[in-house]
């Protein structure tokens, strides 16, 4: 069986998926749903998952949610929030994805894959 995916490959694939869901949109991402903004710092994969997991019925981000869970060491369920959330700001999923994508690109360029 294939071995574990290298962190660099996993991060690149997450970036590619985020780019993919923003391309050629015919309708607003997740119907314009709002999510909590997060601090893009240590532990942000879990924080991003905690925020996005509360969006239901949005098939466009299901793969992203699965991929984020691979970066998060603990199980995340809807309604769960860590201290990493800026719990006073809600933004559209489309904007959340832009913020996350930019941060991940910077991590990838800097060689910070974990």
């Amino acid at each position: 069986s294939p071995g574990p995916v290298p962190p660099s490959t996993a991060l690149r694939e997450l970036i590619e998926e985020l780019v993919n869901i923003t391309q050629n949109q015919k309708a607003p991402l997740c119907n314009g749903s709002m999510v909590w903004s997060i601090n893009l710092t240590a532990g942000m994969y879990c924080a991003a998952l905690e925020s996005l997991i509360n969006v239901s019925g949005c098939s466009a981000i299901e793969k992203t949610q699965r991929m984020l869970s691979g970066f998060c060491p603990h199980k995340v369920s809807a309604g769960q929030f860590s201290s990493l959330h800026v719990r006073d700001t809600k933004i559209e999923v489309a904007q959340f994805v832009k913020d996350l994508l930019l941060h991940l690109k910077k991590l990838f360029r800097e060689g910070r894959f974990n």
Partner: antibody, heavy 118, light 109 residues
Framework: QVQLQESGPGLVKPSETLSLTCSVS????????WSWIRQPAGKGLEWIGR???????NYNSSLKSRVTMSIDTSKNQLSLKLSFMTAADTAVYYC????????????WGQGTLVTVSS | SYVLTQPPSVSVAPGQTARITCGGN??????VHWYQQKPGQAPVLVVY???DRPSGIPERFSGSNSGNTATLTISRVEAGDEADYYC????????????FGGGTKLTVV
Amino acid sequence: QVQLQESGPGLVKPSETLSLTCSVSGGSISSYYWSWIRQPAGKGLEWIGRIYMTGRTNYNSSLKSRVTMSIDTSKNQLSLKLSFMTAADTAVYYCARESGSSYSYDYWGQGTLVTVSS
Amino acid sequence: SYVLTQPPSVSVAPGQTARITCGGNNIGSKGVHWYQQKPGQAPVLVVYDDSDRPSGIPERFSGSNSGNTATLTISRVEAGDEADYYCQVWVSSSDHHVVFGGGTKLTVV
């Protein structure tokens, strides 16, 4: 290919309200953020604000009290209203599409010149 | 408010490399986008998210961003590259907004 076309009066009197429309063709207006940006002759670009299909807006704080943006998804059009116009508002006004994956602008209209004069 | 500072002008000979800077407080933490604008035309995106190129933009255009300075580099400059260049960032704060640099006139001498 996405195309943006601004339209509106070329001349506005001082203290009046400017109304501009941006018609989008070749793509859906519903799935992107849209901005208005202006450029006085011989000067740099100034961001006016942005709007999403939900109607949510962000405005330049220096213009906030005078700006209203709206979106009509059925007509694939955006509109900009800027009140209490002065000579300092004379500029080329552009509408632009924010990229889906970043905060950059990947499509721009050709711009429309608005002159404020009595 | 957030300010982006660009040199008003940069001159370069054909075939040489032009570097246009964009300074801002901790700009390295932001995504920087660069536009080329020729007289009488709308701006055209040439680099986004620091160093990515839109399709159709030559590889001669590249970008970097760290610390307090972002840089647009144009290698093997051609006469057709003469234009105004603007940097732009999105400032995510309590008051979300877009900021443009003042622009740099690139002259090919």
